[in-house]
Every structure is written in structure tokens, then in C-alpha cells.
Amino acid sequence: MAVTACQGLGFVVSLIGIAGIIAATCMDQWSTQDLYNNPVTAVFNYQGLWRSCVRESSGFTECRGYFTLLGLPAMLQAVRALMIVGIVLGAIGLLVSIFALKCIRIGSMEDSAKANMTLTSGIMFIVSGLCAIAGVSVFANMLVTNFWMSTANMYTGMGGMVQTVQTRYTFGAALFVGWVAGGLTLIGGVMMCIACRGLAPEETNYKAVSYHASGHSVAYKPGGFKASTGFGSNTKNKKIYDGGARTEDEVQSYPSKHDYV
């Protein structure tokens, strides 16, 4: 039960995280005009990975895409790449993890296959989260480096976009969304990897084990086997008693701290 909960929670956390990474990547507010000392200009500038926007004091907002690829700074291209890789890996991870979920039955899928898929999706989520965190951090570092600007903004040469006033840019909302989302995806991935350990069948050197417990006997055989205990497929060849998960070798012992996932 703990394994299923861990896996399900890992999936949900990763799903939220990846949705956040997608949202951050699409957001326009990666960098926003610094208004620390009252507004100096009657326009508010903010920039994303794909376009820059200007909001006038009337509320009128105008956004312009960066209609150039070669003219963009390498750092911005790197951030775009990291975020896209993060999204792609996360999306694939979500797809894989759906089929790996213990609560979903697809044909006669082996428990070992589900365990492998859970681990694969977990690793994908971890890498996805790291990509997002790295991308956001690179952009944040770029902002800090460019904080005190004189006449050109951080995208000098971006399709001829030269800022001719002293505009300072600070962290936009997208950075915080990206950091949190990346962290959630990372946590979700770790949870999936932990759940994988609980799903993987134990390797044994013997064919079968017979034992007596609670007045009835159950014969366990390695592999995809449904025990007649009412629990459905028992993917770790375990029987659950009073919340304590015990392997064949531990049937007569009390639950130890290692028994809980």
C-alpha cells in the first residue's frame, strides 16, 4: 500500500512540476523592470524567453517576439534548450509513469516491467527537474550579471533591440515558478525511484517456499503470481500483516524499520 501511495504521489507531484515548467517556459516575465526606487519611466518592460513586452501606464500592453535565432545571446539559447529538454523528458516520463502505475492494469504486464518503468520515469523526472532548475538558475545569473546596465539591456543585438535608457532588470515571476516547478519534478522523480524499490521482485535462489501462517498456507513462487489472500497481485512477493511488510525470510519475525517504504 505504501508503495502504491509513494508511486501515486510521485506521479502527481511530477505532473504538477512539469505543468509548472511548461508554464514558466511560456511566461513573459522572466525578467522585469526594476521598480525599487519608484517608477522612473511611464512604461514597464518585462521579458521572457520568446518575446519582450511593454506595458504603458494606461494598461496597454505590447509584446514583440524575438524574430531572430542567430542574433540571440548563447546564454538565452542555452536556457531555452534546457527548458525544452526538461519539458520533453518530463512529458515522456509522465507517459511512461502512467503505464507503470500500480493501480493501473495493462494486460498481463509483469511486475518487474512496472518496476523498470517506474525507475525510468523517476530518472526522467529527476533529469527534467534538474534541467529546469539549471535553466532558471543560468537566466538568474545572467540577470544578476547585467543588473547594473548603462545604455543597453541584456539582449543587446537581439534583432536590433537596443535599450537606450538606463533600465535595470530584476527577477520575474517565471523564475520563481521555474525553481518551484523544477524542485517538485525532482522530488516526484525521487519518489518514483523509491517506489521502484518497493515494486521490484526479490531475487531468490530457490524455486518455492512453503510456510504456515494464520492457520492457512500459501505457496509462493517467484514471478507474476496472484496469492489467494485477497490482495490481488502482490508485486514484492510479500504478505501484509498489521501494516508490517515481511518477505518470505521474515515471516516469523516482527516488522523492522527496514520493512516500511
Epitope: P39, V40, A42, V43, Q47, V54, S57, Q163, T167
Partner: antibody
Framework: EVQLQQSGPELVKPGTSVKMSCKAS????????MHWVKLSHGKSLEWIGY????????IYNQRFKGKATLTVNKSSRTAYMDLRSLTSEDSAVYYC????????????WGQGNSVTVSS | DIVMTQSPSSLTVTPGERVTMSCKSS????????????LTWYQQKPGQPPKLLIY???TRESGVPDRFAGSGSGTDFTLTISRVQAEDLSFYYC?????????FGSGTKLDLR
Amino acid sequence: EVQLQQSGPELVKPGTSVKMSCKASGYTFTDYNMHWVKLSHGKSLEWIGYINPNNGGTIYNQRFKGKATLTVNKSSRTAYMDLRSLTSEDSAVYYCARQGYYGNSMDYWGQGNSVTVSS
Amino acid sequence: DIVMTQSPSSLTVTPGERVTMSCKSSQSLLNGGNQRNYLTWYQQKPGQPPKLLIYWASTRESGVPDRFAGSGSGTDFTLTISRVQAEDLSFYYCQNSYFYPFTFGSGTKLDLR
């Protein structure tokens, strides 16, 4: 039709205060900022500041901070400017002007309110 | 504060003539984010409030005759009236609509011969 109707001319004594009004009609009052501009005799236009009628937020020209106070009454669709501690330097025509949607420009102006400070 | 310098202070022209007036700002009014110049031109006839002619340095306000044209970028701007008419007898003001506080030029007075 957009109209900004300003209150009548004022003849006031030095050291006193005056509160002028600007009643808006023909548009959604809370959707547009209201600016105030001073035109002194023989001088150019001077921007005093503006108020956002939706939230009451103001931005002033530092030169007029402490001299002018901008307020609005949303229900009566009226903007007000309070001028205090008046001197002969404050004798001028004061305009209210609606901020247009583009370019931070002022697209509609009131007819002006003449203020004369004299003892 | 941004200083707006208009020249000449007055112009005497004959109807049908082409006229240009200049406006210079002490700082660039070009915003890099949208590549727009935040300079506005107003016309003020005697005894009347100012009237918006041009915003974003070159965009004509609706209802303004096409003989009025604004140009320039950064710090140097020009208002051109291609064929002056009698009703154009006015003061023309340029305004910085980028930096707070908004500032106006001293104006150019257009007189007809």
C-alpha cells in the same frame, strides 16, 4: 462623446486653498488615468501628475508634491485637484486631461480652469 | 527632469507652404522593449485646451489631417505640416511621455503671413 467638464474660474487670496473639479462623461471613468496640467501666462505647459480612478493611485511631479493633491469620486465620475498655500505663482489655467490608451498621451482635455491668486 | 527644447520659438508662413519644427530631448525617448519613441505632439489654439496630434513620435491621432506628420527617433524629433492652412495658426508643443515627470517643450508659435 467624451467630455471633461471643469469647474468655473476662481479668484482666491494668497495662503488659501482651492479645490477644482473635472466631471467626466461619455466613457468608462475608471478605465482611464486622469492627468492635470498647468498653463501659466507666458510660460509652457507643466505636468502636475495623474490619478488612476480605479484604485486612487497617483504619480506626481516632484515640483507639485505638497502643493497639489489629486483625488477622485468614482460614483460621481469626478476628478479633483486641491491646491494649497496659494501664491501668485499658482495663478494659471489648470487643465484636466484623460490619458489615451496609446503612447501615454492625453487625448481629451477639459476646457481649463482659471485660478487667480490676488490679495 | 528631461528638458525638451523646441525650435524655432515662432514661425511665419504663407498658406500652402510646407513647415517643419524641431524638438530635442535631453535623453533618448526610445524604449528598447517595443522600439517606440515616447514623444507626443499637441496643438493649442488661443483660448482652447491643447489637442492631441501625434503620439509615439509618428502615429497620427484619429481625426487629425494627414498633412500633419511626425518623425524622428531617440532625442531628435520633427513635426511637419505639408500644406499649412489658416486654421493651423496655433502653438505646437512636444511632450516627453516616457520619463516621469512628463515635460513639455516651450512651444513653437505658428503665425500666418
